[in-house]
C-alpha cells in the first residue's frame, strides 16, 4: 500500500474519485500528552473538562506546550517521523508539555474528505486550548502548534478559532492540493498566530505540488528552492530507503520539512540560516546573502520572530542529511575578456582553501549567461566549515551550446591548427560568507598572469578584507 501523499498520481486520482463508502468511524480527536521520550510509552490522554489527567500526567501549566499535528494518512498509523519529533522536543525543552493530536480516524480517509475534516479538528484543538486557558498560569503565548502537511492547515484553523492568539505556529510543508490560492481563512495564514513560520520542501510549479507553493506565514523558508531535496533523488532512494520507488521520493521530499525542524532542535550548535530573496533563481545567482534589515534568519525552532513581516520568502541550501547545515558563499567574478571564445559557454569550478578545511571542487551554477567585461555573481556552498578562507583555485571548461556550434568550432580548428587557445581573463574574485557576513577579496597570485585556458588552473590569494567599492561601507552584522 502506498505511503501518505504519494506518489503524485495517486493523490491526483484521489482528488477526482467519487466518494467511496467509508467505514463508520467516530469523529474523534485525541490529545496524547507524551510523558516520556520512549516512543513505546502510551503517554496520557487529556480529556476536555477533566482536570485529573492534567494532574496525574504532570502537565506543567507554566511551561511551553507543543501540539504536534499529523497530516493525511493512507495507512492509518502514526509514521516514524512522529516519535523522532517528540523525542527532539523533549531533548530540547525538558520541562515542556508535548501533546500529539491524534486525528487518525478523520485523516485515514479519501484526501478530499480528510481536507474537509481539517476544520473540525482545528476546532477541537481550539476548544482544548480555550479550556486550558481557564486554568491558572496557562498562557496561550506559550503554545506552539507544529503541523505537518494537512496538519499545518489544521493548526491554522486552531489558531483562527481559539479565543486569543497562539504564540507560534510552525507549518512543515503545508499541504498544497485544495489549499493553493485559497482564502486566508481556509488555510494556514499569518493571522493564525503571533508568529507563523513555514518550511516548504515539496513544491512543484509543474504537475501536482504536494506542498503549498505560495507563502502562508510571516516567514516562508524554501530549502533548496523548496523543490528537489538532496538525498531524495530516485538514485538515493533506491539505495538507502525502504521501498525505493517514486512514492519514496515524494515522501522523502515532503517529510524533509520535519527533519529540518528536528535538526534545528537537536543540532542547536549547527544552525542553518536562510536568506530573504524574491525568488529561487535570484538566490541561486548568489545575490541574496544579506543579513541587513532582518534579511536572514535561523530556520526551524531557532527562527527569530520577525515583526511586521508578511510573506517573507527565504532560501537556503542544505546537506542530504543531519546535520543539514551548509556554508553559503557569494562569489563575484569579473570576467575582463574572452579570447577566441566563439560560441562557447564557460563553466567555472572553484576549490576553496581555509584555515579549518578545504572544499571539494565546486561547480558554479550558471543561472544566466556569463557576461564578458562584467561582474558575474554565483552561489557556492560547502558542507564543512572551512574557517577563514585563504585561497581559491579556479578552473573552467567550455560547453558548446549546440552540435552546430561544436561543428563550427571543430572546422575552425582544423582549418587553422595554430589558432591560439581560448582564454578568459580574471583578476580577482570577491567572496562574501552568508554565515559570517564577512567580505573578502582574492587577487590573482601572479598579477601578470590572469588569463586562463580550459582545464588550466588560476590561483587567487586573499588580498584584503572587505570589497573596495565606491560609496560603500561594510556594516558590522550580527547574525540572529
Amino acid at each position: 500500500s502506498p505511503t501518505p501523499f504519494g506518489p503524485e498520481g495517486q493523490l491526483a486520482d484521489e482528488l477526482h474519485k467519487p466518494k467511496a463508502i467509508q467505514t463508520e468511524v467516530k469523529p474523534s480527536v485525541r490529545f496524547n500528552l507524551r510523558t516520556s521520550k520512549d516512543p513505546e510509552h502510551e503517554g496520557c490522554y487529556l480529556s476536555l473538562g477533566h482536570s485529573q489527567p492534567l494532574e496525574d500526567c504532570g502537565f506543567n501549566m507554566t511551561a511551553k506546550t507543543f501540539f504536534i499535528i499529523h497530516g493525511w494518512t493512507m495507512s492509518g498509523i502514526f509514521e516514524n517521523w512522529l516519535h523522532k519529533l517528540v523525542s527532539a522536543l523533549h531533548t530540547r525543552e525538558k520541562d515542556a508539555n508535548v501533546v500529539v493530536v491524534d486525528w487518525l480516524p478523520l485523516a485515514h480517509q479519501l484526501y478530499t474528505d480528510a481536507v474537509n475534516n481539517t476544520r473540525v479538528v482545528g476546532h477541537s484543538i481550539a476548544r482544548m486550548l480555550d479550556w486550558l486557558q481557564e486554568k491558572d498560569d496557562f498562557s496561550l503565548g506559550n503554545v506552539h502548534l507544529i503541523g505537518y502537511s494537512l496538519g499545518a492547515h489544521v493548526a491554522g484553523y486552531a489558531g483562527n478559532f481559539v479565543k486569543g492568539t497562539v504564540g507560534r505556529i510552525t507549518g512543515l510543508d503545508p499541504a498544497g492540493p485544495m489549499f493553493e490560492g485559497a482564502d486566508i481563512h481556509k488555510r494556514l495564514s499569518p493571522d493564525d498566530a503571533d508568529f507563523v513560520d513555514v518550511l516548504h520542501t515539496y513544491t512543484r510549479s509543474f504537475g501536482l505540488s504536494i506542498g503549498i507553493q505560495m507563502p502562508v506565514g510571516h516567514i516562508d523558508i524554501y530549502p533548496n528552492g523548496g523543490d528537489f531535496q538532496p538525498g531524495c533523488g530516485l538514485n538515493d532512494v533506491l539505495g538507502s530507503m525502504a521501498y525505493g520507488t517514486i512514492t519514496e521520493v515524494v515522501k522523502c521530499e515532503h517529510e524533509r520539512a520535519v527533519h529540518l525542524f528536528v535538526d534545528s532542535l537537536v543540532n542547536q550548535d549547527k544552525p542553518s540560516f536562510a536568506f530573504q530573496c524574491t525568488d529561487s533563481n535570484r538566490f541561486k545567482k548568489g545575490i541574496c546573502l544579506s543579513c541587513r534589515k532582518n534579511r536572514c534568519n535561523s530556520i526551524g525552532y531557532n527562527a527569530k520572530k520577525m515583526r511586521n513581516k508578511r510573506n517573507s520568502k527565504m532560501y537556503l541550501k542544505t546537506r542530504a542529511g543531519m546535520p543539514f547545515r551548509v556554508y553559503h558563499y557569494q562569489m563575484k567574478i569579473h570576467v575582463f575578456s574572452y579570447k577566441n571564445m566563439g560560441e562557447i559557454e564557460p563553466t567555472f569550478y572553484v576549490t576553496l582553501y581555509g584555515t579549518n578545511a578545504d572544499s571539494q571542487t565546486l561547480p558554479l551554477e550558471i543561472v544566466e549567461r556569463i557576461e564578458q567585461n562584467a561582474t558575474n555573481t554565483f552561489l557556492v556552498y560547502t558542507e564543512e566549515d572551512l574557517g577563514d578562507l585563504l585561497k581559491i583555485q579556479l578552473t573552467w571548461e567550455g560547453a558548446s551550446q549546440s552540435w552546430y556550434n561544436l561543428w563550427k568550432e571543430l572546422r575552425s580548428y582544423l582549418s587553422q591548427p595554430h589558432n591560439p587557445g581560448r582564454e578568459l581573463n580574471i583578476r580577482r574574485i570577491r567572496v562574501k560568507s552568508g554565515e559570517t557576513q564577512r567580505k573578502l577579496t582574492f587577487c590573482a597570485e601572479d598579477p601578470e598572469n590572469t588569463s586562463i585556458s580550459p582545464g588550466r588552473e588560476l590561483w587567487f590569494r586573499k588580498c584584503r578584507d572587505g570589497w573596495r567599492m565606491k560609496n560603500e561601507t561594510s556594516p558590522t552584522v550580527e547574525l540572529p
Partner: antibody
Framework: QIQLVQSGPELKKPGETVKISCKAS????????MNWVKQAPGKDLKWMGW????????TYADDFKGRFAFSLETSASTAYLQINNLKNEDTATYFC?????????????WGQGTTLTVSS | DIVLTQSPASLAVSLGQRATISCKAS??????????MNWYQQKPGQPPQLLIY???NLGSGIPARFSGSGSGTDFTLNIHPVEEEDAATYYC??????????FGGGTKLEIK
Amino acid sequence: QIQLVQSGPELKKPGETVKISCKASGYTFTNYGMNWVKQAPGKDLKWMGWINTYSGVPTYADDFKGRFAFSLETSASTAYLQINNLKNEDTATYFCARFSYYGRHYFDYWGQGTTLTVSS
Amino acid sequence: DIVLTQSPASLAVSLGQRATISCKASQSVDYDGDSYMNWYQQKPGQPPQLLIYAASNLGSGIPARFSGSGSGTDFTLNIHPVEEEDAATYYCHQSTDDPPWTFGGGTKLEIK
C-alpha cells in the same frame, strides 16, 4: 500484568463462519493497536492486518481482504477476528498481538493463539 | 511488499557456542538513522516472543546473550553463549512506516 487471552480451539466445516476473540488486560485497551497474525501448520507467520482499537477502523493485508473482518467490543477490552465462508486453507493458528501507536510498530505482547481446523 | 529472507533455514549449535542467524530484506528498512527490524523467538505450541526491536534493542526481560545488529537490508541475530532453552524457531519482522508488515521464513535452532 499485561495479558492477551484468546478463545479456545475451533473445528469448523468449509463454508461456515468462525469468530475468534482476544481479551486484553493490564493496560488501557484503546491506547494500543491490535494485529492479527496467521500461522498455518509448519509454516511461517503472516501478518493479516490490524485494527485501531479507539476508532474501530480496520486495515487488512491484501491476502485477507474479503472474507476476514476485525471488530471490537471496547467495553470488554476485546478484539475479534471473524472469518466467513471458511476454506480448508484457513486451517491455522491465529494470534492477536498489540503494538504501540506512537512507537516503532513492533509486537510486544501476543495472545496464546487460537487453533482453527477446517475440515469436511 | 518487502520480502525478508532468513538463513540458514535450520542450524545446530553446541551448548555454550554462538548461533548466528541472518535476515536479508528485499529493500532497505532504514529510516532516518533507525532500522525497523525486529526479532522474535517461538517455541512449539507457544506464541512468538519479542527478543529484539529496532535492529539492536533488547526486549523487556530478554537475557543479554541475545543481540541484534545490522542496517539497511542486512541484519543478524546472535545468541552467545547458547543455552538449552534457546532451542526454538526465530523470525525477523520489518515494521517500516507503511504496511504490510512482513516476517521472514524462520530459522530453526537445535542445540547439540
